[in-house]
Interface confidence: medium
């Protein structure tokens, strides 16, 4: 019995269907086929879980969270024992193993391994201003998405004709911050943060209004 090499990893957007490949060759009839799919979850690597089982001609559910979402892609028994996972969730990310036995066929490699990564687009980021908006002050524009896998990067733009940030601004696309030093009237305006990763983008807006000091009355 020999399980075929499978592609190292599968990536899928959250909520979509993932297909995890596993196929084998055997010299025996598929009368005693036994297939166990296991996962080592990324979130809990010391607790492997059963995903789905096929033994004695019957299919059995694995861990509760897979119930009703997992099945074999083809009619069993078969030498293609790939599975699908519907409505993928973040917790499905992990290393999946198919363990195949088909007595009396012994020997050979009976395990296939495939990684699954569930990708999540950035959630709507939050835009905030830190610091005083008085003329001449320093302000920090903050942008952060609660969700996003891979981790989003953040791009700030000023929504005027140029889309350029003020010359006194420095941007950190990883942290999602823009520091604007010595703000002036020209710093006022609408700013947009674009959070993006491999599978999506999301934006938020922020209105910066620089406060000029009131002239003193004599």
């Amino acid at each position: 019995l020999e399980v075929s090499e499978s592609p190292g990893s599968v990536q899928v957007a959250r909520g979509q269907t993932a297909v995890l490949p596993c196929a084998f060759s055997t010299s025996a009839a598929l009368l005693n086929l036994n297939v166990i799919w296991m996962v080592i979850p990324l979130s809990n690597a010391n607790q492997p879980e059963q995903v789905i089982l096929y033994q004695g001609g019957q299919m059995f559910d694995g861990a509760l969270r897979f119930h009703g979402r997992v099945g074999f892609t083809g009619t069993m028994p078969a030498t293609n024992v790939s599975i699908f996972i519907n409505n993928t969730q973040l917790s499905d990310t992990g290393t999946y193993q198919c363990l195949v036995n088909n007595l009396p066929d012994r020997g050979g490699r009976n395990i296939g391994v495939t990684g699954l990564t569930v990708l999540v687009p950035p959630s709507a980021p939050q835009c905030q201003i830190q610091g005083s908006q008085d003329l001449g002050s320093d302000v920090i524009l903050l942008c952060s998405s609660e969700e996003g896998i891979p981790r989003p990067t953040y791009l700030w733009e000023k929504l005027d004709n140029t889309l350029k940030l003020p010359p006194t601004a420095t941007q950190d696309q990883v942290q999602g911050t823009v520091t604007i030093r010595n703000i002036s009237a020209l710093s006022s305006g609408l700013y947009q943060c674009v959070a993006s990763n491999a599978i999506g983008t999301s934006t938020c807006l922020l209105d910066l209004q620089v406060i000029s000091p009131q002239p003193r009355s004599v």
């Epitope: 019957q58 559910d61 694995g62 861990a63 509760l64 009703g68 969730q89 973040l90 917790s91």
Partner: antibody, heavy 120, light 108 residues
Framework: EVQLVESGGGLVKPGGSLRLSCAAS????????MSWVRQAPGKGLEWVGR??????????DYAAPVKGRFTISRDDSKNTLYLQMNSLKTEDTAVYYC???????????WGQGTLVTVSS | SYELTQPPSVSVSPGQTASITCSGD??????ASWYQQKPGQSPVLVIY???KRPSGIPERFSGSNSGNTATLTISGTQAEDEADYYC???????????FGGGTKLTVL
Amino acid sequence: EVQLVESGGGLVKPGGSLRLSCAASGFTFSNAWMSWVRQAPGKGLEWVGRIKSKTDGGTTDYAAPVKGRFTISRDDSKNTLYLQMNSLKTEDTAVYYCARLHIYGPFDYWGQGTLVTVSS
Amino acid sequence: SYELTQPPSVSVSPGQTASITCSGDKLGDKYASWYQQKPGQSPVLVIYQDSKRPSGIPERFSGSNSGNTATLTISGTQAEDEADYYCLSYLARSGSVVFGGGTKLTVL
């Protein structure tokens, strides 16, 4: 050591509302699916509803008799499970248990229960 | 709606074997769990996934599940085993949980 401690039970009039809490400790609460189960005096166990972990979607399911009246929620930052009960009926009188769902489906840990009495 | 049926009561002499059944349509296609509940106490899981025993549960407790019936077997029953026993099944499609009506085990 896993611990689940319910609170918030008491006497309430029909049509009234009550919120039960369940404080969890001894395990990673944010990864756990949690349920409420109730037991009317002298009767059997009855499943009320369940909430998945946030990473599993955070969705809820409810038993038919409480659907639309009861709401299960969780605050992972406080390791606390909630049961908001509205439009209470006399038949909702029971001891309410919070329980953790084992990865393979059964409830592996239970709280001590809190009594809810709905009476005029 | 799905129902699980248990006998209301079962009696057994100390040291003998007690069997408690739980019946439901094609129950053997689902996993069954069993709980023990003593008066004034919370339920305790004694069997899950048809036949698995959680740590701390004595070996005299065993379970099986096939066809339409799951069975909890207590061999060498002891006085401390006197309690109510509930079966449970998880319904994957609806996401709901169903308990049996419970069986009172009396150790004579």
